[in-house]
């Protein structure tokens, strides 16, 4: 499945839960605005609470988690609150205090992730060439780590998986981990012309100009993220399905498994040559600047099913479902997109004049 | 060199009480939870308290809470297990780890505690706690 620009005979996957949103209206609101009080939250809003046992007493009003007030259905809810733990309350959460600036200064950075991507105005860079992947055909053994870091599902990756960005540009790959939305409600952390996606894929990658992540945060270039989106398609993907069936082992937060080798490519899209490229941030606290974040045209379709287990197997902090684990569009400040491919030319008789307003500046760079 | 390193384990009385030190050498600690963990002879490693730099949340098990405080010297790159009203359950070697923080590693303290085995990015060797009269 491709996204629609440019694409005479595929329309936009019909599975992708969410309607567009071309007043961009789900950027106005942010994880760093504190809740509106004033509004009561509604209850199918609030996140499915695992039952207490009897001993523990009734659930409690002030044990709910806290969630954003009603307003975009897209918005990602509050799904970390009050700690069934009863620490403190200051760890960084979607959708509600602390404000995320107050949690890491860097989030307030003038270049943060995600964004949304409008490809008309995307500058179109030749220079930009077919990404290459080495090693990432993983074999069986050694077995790798899946686990619930709390806010997502994530897979360490070994060494020996290689990216290169251009010429000079090595990267070693990191881990990948997933972002969703919950049943109805899609979860991707970019969008396209204000369509979130059901959710998206991350993997993260480090320069090898630095041996330590702590190294290369927060440096220009230091990390770099491929991205792509999640859609709904009639198949059962089965890359993805080596890693989806591990959900139910690793439900707790914090909880772990090991899970065997794979091919780490085959979760990527097929075509790694048409994608959006622009610098940003990480997309959760710490927030460091300066990651490269290639955003690929061609989505990856899973089956409903899949989906559905990807955001309804897990926990998160106080006992709250796993959900909705995205950051809504951050202001691109004067940044430009750029694309390997020319985006904003539309087959569709309606565009047959389009304008390209921004120009490629990097050339690849 | 990249490494962590315990110190302040003893022998003390039950209700008595010890500082642990934990220092980070070639790393900083800005970006990363902390956590100190403990096994006792014949148990499973377990999470005793965390505390993450980035956004300062902290956590402790329901065993030591009320008893133990965790805190770090930013300056001086060291995090500490402050253990009051020491009884003879918690005697065991007594571990510091730490993990990338966010997205990159842990996402949350409570996570960080319940990392039984050594995958974190950084442990220490341990040092023994003994609690006996």
């Known amino acids: 499945q491709r996204l629609p620009w440019m694409q005479e005979d595929s329309p936009l996957g019909g599975g992708s839960s969410g309607e567009d949103d071309p007043l961009h209206e789900e950027d106005l609101p942010s994880e760093e605005d504190p809740p509106r009080e004033e509004d009561p939250p509604r209850e199918e809003d609030l996140p499915e609470v695992k039952p207490k046992s009897e001993e523990e007493g009734s659930l409690k009003l002030e044990d709910l988690p806290t969630v954003e007030a009603p307003g975009d259905p897209q918005e990602p809810q509050n799904n970390a609150h009050r700690d069934k733990e009863g620490d403190n309350q200051r760890h960084w959460r979607y959708g509600g205090d602390p404000p995320w600036p107050q949690v890491s200064p860097a989030c307030a950075g003038r270049f943060q992730s995600p964004v949304d991507i409008r490809p008309q105005l995307a500058a179109f860079c030749p220079a930009l060439r077919p990404l290459e992947l080495l090693g990432f055909e993983l074999p069986l053994l050694p077995e790798l780590r899946l686990r619930n870091n709390g806010h997502s599902v994530q897979l360490t990756l070994p060494s020996g998986l290689e990216m290169a960005l251009g010429p000079g540009r090595e990267y070693r790959a990191l881990q990948l981990h997933l972002h969703w939305g919950a049943v109805g409600r899609p979860g991707s952390e970019h969008t396209v012309e204000g369509h979130r996606f059901p959710a998206e894929i991350h993997v993260v990658h480090i320069s090898t100009a630095y041996a330590r992540v702590e190294e290369a945060l927060g440096r220009p270039g230091g990390l770099a993220v491929l991205a792509a989106f999640l859609e709904e398609g009639p198949e059962e993907n089965s890359a993805y399905e080596q890693l989806l069936s591990h959900l139910e082992e690793i439900a707790e937060e914090g909880s772990e498994t090991q899970v065997p080798g794979l091919d780490v490519s085959a979760l990527l899209p097929s075509d790694l040559s048409r994608y959006f490229r622009y610098e940003g941030s990480l997309t959760t606290p710490p927030c460091a600047q300066g990651v490269i974040w290639t955003v690929f045209n061609q989505t990856v379709m899973l089956s409903a099913k899949q989906l559905h287990a990807l955001s309804d197997a897990l926990w998160g902090p106080g006992d709250s479902r796993l959900q909705l684990n995205f950051r809504v569009t951050q202001p691109l400040n004067g940044r430009v997109i750029e694309a390997s491919f020319p985006a904003g030319v539309d087959s569709s008789p309606r565009a047959a004049e389009p304008v390209q307003l921004n120009s490629c500046l990097a050339a690849g760079d | 060199q990249v490494k962590l390193e315990e110190s302040g384990g003893d022998l003390v009385q039950p209700g008595g009480s010890l500082r642990l030190s934990c220092a980070a050498s070639?790393?900083?600690?800005?970006?990363?939870?902390i956590g100190w963990f403990r096994q006792a002879p014949g148990k499973e490693r377990e999470g005793v308290s965390c505390?993450?730099?980035?956004?300062?949340?902290?956590y402790y098990a329901d065993s030591v809470k009320g008893r133990f405080t965790i805190s770090r010297d930013n300056a001086k790159n060291m995090v500490y297990l402050q253990m009051n009203s020491l009884k003879p359950e918690d005697t065991a070697i007594y571990y510091c780890?730490?993990?990338?923080?966010?997205?990159?590693?842990?996402?949350?303290?409570?996570?960080?505690?319940?990392?039984?085995?050594?995958?974190?990015?950084?442990w220490g060797q341990g040092t023994q706690v003994t609690v006996s009269s």
């Open positions: 780890a730490a993990e990338l923080y966010g997205e990159l590693g842990v996402a949350t303290v409570q996570a960080m505690c319940r990392l039984t085995t050594p995958g974190g990015d950084y």
């Open positions: 070639g790393f900083t600690l800005d970006y990363y939870a």
């Open positions: 505390f993450s730099s980035v956004d300062g949340s902290t």
